[in-house]
């Protein structure tokens, strides 16, 4: 009946509703149907959220913070539904809401505890700083404070730096990990316990490839089945690192099945894509193609990073000409 939020029943006419920042929610309240219905929703027993009586809304003394954000299910009031539809919740809306319902038969009071969570999709970034390599798991906006765990080759890592900045209504978090000289695979998990939402970033370095000039190279990129769900929207980006910054070679959007290619020598196999294999070919290699190639498969629930190091060496012909 209430599709926009999930709630847990707890004793004493009190329910917990969990909403997401900027989304709409429903604060549930029901009563035994009767005539002369009066409904008053209040926040923290002080602020007027919504009032309805004598067959219509009375919002003259509604607290300004709720203006144009609340409504009732008017066609269902006579059936005993006093639930409040609440638009665009913010973290400031967290707290206890009381629904007073009076009818010709009885008066009932229901309490609803609203908790609001934030979880803007995190990202896993691979960065070079001078001679050091870093993996950074970051989330721009999250509430409450998340749990961040790192694993190296599936073994938890205890050292876990967390750079945190708190704004008025959420946290911004960076968790960097120095992976200089490592060939291990890494996994970072960020969990929002309130929203019961988990995001995972996984980083894998493939063995280096040595190629001759003018040859082509095939670089593999296949999602790990544990994370990958083909029904979920995702994006695949291939990029190349040059002098510390990545330039995008191509990307693919699963929602539109669009492929955009920025490098004419880059090719993707459509049939392989249909089988969720995002391996790519780079034709006619030249010396400047040496470097790190990054495949990034990202959805709301995961980021899978695969790094290939390619060394392009001069061909015998080129060497003898010199």
């Amino acid at each position: 009946i209430f599709p926009l939020a999930f709630f847990i029943y707890v004793p004493m006419n009190e329910q917990i509703v969990i909403g997401r920042l900027d989304e709409d929610i429903i604060l549930p309240s029901s009563f035994e149907r009767g005539s002369e219905v009066v409904i008053h929703w209040k926040y923290q027993d002080s602020y007027k959220v919504h009032s309805y009586y004598k067959g219509s809304d009375h919002l003259e003394s509604q607290d300004p913070r709720y203006a144009n954000r609340t409504s009732l299910f008017y066609n269902e009031i006579q059936n005993g539904n006093a639930s409040l539809f609440f638009r665009r919740v913010s973290l400031l809306d967290e707290g206890i809401y009381t629904c007073y319902v009076g009818t010709a038969i009885q008066v009932i009071t229901n309490k609803v505890v609203l908790k609001v969570g934030v979880f803007l999709t995190p990202v896993m970034k691979y960065e070079k700083r001078n001679t050091n390599s870093f993996l950074i798991c970051s989330v721009l906006s999250v509430y409450p404070r998340p749990i961040i765990t790192w694993k190296m080759d599936n073994t938890p890592i205890s050292e876990n730096n967390m750079e945190e900045t708190g704004s008025l209504d959420s946290f911004s978090i960076n968790s960097p990990l120095n992976i200089t000289g490592s060939n291990s695979s890494y996994e970072c998990t960020i969990e929002n316990s309130l929203l019961k939402q988990t995001w995972t970033g996984r980083w894998t370095m493939k063995d280096g490839l040595h190629k001759m000039q003018s040859e082509h190279v095939s670089l593999s990129c296949q999602p790990v089945n544990d994370y990958f769900s083909p029904n979920q929207d995702f994006k695949v980006t291939w990029s190349r690192m040059k002098s510390g910054t990545f330039s995008v070679l191509a990307y693919y959007l699963s929602s539109s099945q669009n492929t955009i290619i920025n490098e004419s020598r880059f090719s993707w196999n459509k049939e392989l894509i249909n089988q969720s294999d995002f391996s790519m070919n780079l034709m006619d290699l030249n010396l400047s193609d040496s470097g790190e190639y990054l495949c990034n498969i990202s959805s709301d629930e995961y980021t899978l990073l695969t790094i290939h190091t390619v060394h392009v060496e001069p061909s015998q012909e080129t060497a003898s000409h010199n």
Epitope: V38, K54, Y100, V107
Partner: antibody, heavy 121, light 107 residues
Framework: QVQLVESGGGVVQPGRSLRLSCAAS????????IHWVRQAPGKGLEWVAV????????YYADSVRGRFTISRDNSKNTLSLQMNSLRVEDTAVYYC??????????????WGQGTLVTVSS | DIQMTQSPSTLSASVGDRVTITCRAS??????LAWYQQKPGKAPKLLIY???SLESGVPSRFSGSGSGTEFTLTISSLQPDDLATYYC?????????FGQGTKLEIK
């Protein structure tokens, strides 16, 4: 059963003050709005004021606004009407009456027996 | 304020008669009208709310009708116990106002 008992009436000189009380029982006091309604001797009924269930909303008839103050103590199940600057025309039997619910409906389901206020010099 | 006008001011009827009292509002009050009965020396008693809804415990010989500005209270078969003054009251808007009352006498 629902009971409302008014007290505090009496004879008072014009310009003076009087405080009426209403003791409630037989229902959850904090769930209901309570009104004061008065009736001058041999005359009709006149609504005076209402206070909503939690005490935050108070409304008054034009004839008493600024002179009378309605209040309630939900922990003691009592309602009060502080009457200042009394006038001869305030002479009446004062009834406290319970609203259908919060106070928002505005009609009177249960009534007390009334207390007489006489303003006379 | 909304003015409420009752008619007649006094009404004399016999036991068993059908009695009708009228109440007029100076502006539309939808159906937000109540009727009360007040016996001599007693507090008023609610009979009808929302123009036509019978309050619990009130005998079914009492009924109400009307909406907007014209309302009636009907006693289908007058009983000796109905000797009283009857008031209409609008609760559409503050300030709530009563009619001046209709005194019902038994012949």
């Amino acid at each position: 059963q629902v009971q409302l008992v008014e007290s505090g009436g009496g004879v008072v000189q014009p310009g003076r003050s009087l405080r009426l009380s209403c003791a409630a029982s037989g229902f959850t006091f904090s769930d209901y709005g309570i009104h004061w309604v008065r009736q001058a001797p041999g005359k009709g009924l006149e609504w005076v004021a209402v206070i909503w269930y939690e005490g935050s909303d108070k409304y008054y008839a034009d004839s008493v606004r600024g002179r009378f103050t309605i209040s309630r103590d939900n922990s003691k199940n009592t309602l009060s009407l502080q009457m200042n600057s009394l006038r001869v025309e305030d002479t009446a039997v004062y009834y406290c009456a319970r609203d259908r619910s919060s106070g928002a409906m505005g009609y009177f389901v249960y009534w007390g027996q009334g207390t007489l206020v006489t303003v006379s010099s | 304020d909304i003015q409420m006008t009752q008619s007649p001011s006094t009404l004399s009827a016999s036991v068993g008669d059908r009695v009708t009292i009228t109440c007029r509002a100076s502006q539309s009050i939808s159906s937000w009208l109540a009727w009360y009965q007040q016996k001599p020396g007693k507090a008023p008693k609610l009979l009808i709310y929302k123009a036509s809804s019978l309050e619990s415990g009130v005998p079914s010989r009492f009924s109400g009708s009307g909406s907007g500005t014209e309302f009636t209270l009907t006693i289908s078969s007058l009983q000796p116990d109905d000797l009283a003054t009857y008031y209409c009251q609008q609760y559409n808007a503050y300030s709530y106002t009563f009619g001046q009352g209709t005194k019902l006498e038994i012949k």
